[in-house]
Amino acid sequence: APVRSLHCTLRDAQLKSLVMSGPYELKALHLQGQDLEQQVVFSMSFVQGEESNDKIPVALGLKAKNLYLSCVLKDDKPTLQLESVDPKNYPKKKMEKRFVFNKIEINNKLEFESAQFPNWYISTSQAESMPVFLGGTRGGQDITDFTMQFVS
């Protein structure tokens, strides 16, 4: 089946938006007014993964770019990166595991757990303009809760 995708933006629980920071990094900061146009639009694809009644496997690409969020080990630590892919082959229903996140909805907030590294989540810092990263704790100082805004 052709992979089903939707376009959306994400904001963390502090209402920080996600923007590009260089060619292969995202950062989170508060945006207002016209600056909101800077935020990245994701193409969220619904893919095969270890789906459960509580978790929906998705891949997060950047709209109109051949870049996907992926999770890899760097210096023995699970790390979030933006990875370039061949646009002829992506998105696809059967994404490699490093591209897959388990979308978890709790109290109208979303978490994105790495399929490759269970219990590691897309995270932002409390501080402004810091990189979006893969964090191994939830409920601590770092933010793992997001809201999603649909984009037509």
Epitope: A1, Q48, E50, N53, K93, K94
Partner: antibody
Framework: EVQLQESGPGLVKPSETLSLTCTVS????????VSWIRQPPGKGLEWIGL???????YYNSPLKSRLTISKDTSKSQVSLKLSSVTAADTAVYYC????????????????WGQGTLVTVSS | DIQMTQSPSSLSASVGDRVTITCQAS??????LNWYQQKPGKAPKLLIS???ILRPGVPSRFSGSGSGTDFTFTISSLQPEDFATYYC?????????FGQGTKLEIK
Amino acid sequence: EVQLQESGPGLVKPSETLSLTCTVSGFSLSDYGVSWIRQPPGKGLEWIGLIWGSGDTYYNSPLKSRLTISKDTSKSQVSLKLSSVTAADTAVYYCAKQTNLWAYDLYSMDYWGQGTLVTVSS
Amino acid sequence: DIQMTQSPSSLSASVGDRVTITCQASQDIDDDLNWYQQKPGKAPKLLISLASILRPGVPSRFSGSGSGTDFTFTISSLQPEDFATYYCLQSDSFPLTFGQGTKLEIK
């Protein structure tokens, strides 16, 4: 060699809870998911639900409110509990190993146990 | 949920015959289609995965084809041990769903 073996009582009274165990060998429950499937006498196959290596579960909607699938990885056992059973739950119950080949063949089931017949009757 | 419509529900054939069973999905499932053989009192055995890939140890007289919504399972020359019930299974998305089965009987 991959093997799965179902066990449990062959007779359960209506309104009680059906409890089955699937004991596996030849693979680790932390690496592979296990599904449960049932087959009423003389009828076709119905997929019940599964538990992944992570412990996350997916339950088929018609049974979701009555179903619990859990596992003990150290004992290589997966358990199925189905509450408030009726005669319609009489079936041969199978457990089966998920293929778990990411980006290739994640959801199919490649090895099955021999099945155990559970009859719901008073 | 994806519905799988399998036909025929039963089939009489003789040793040496060529036999074809079809399975139709209610929506596009790419090649995520499996074929199982079940003999009386036994568990189903996976013969073909991903629509056309023969599992190790399965005789080459069994074959599968198709993609999208329409799939075919063929036994090129029936052997006595092939008389059984055959099921298709879609493994595209949850819940996994089976066809109703095809009982292959000796004519």
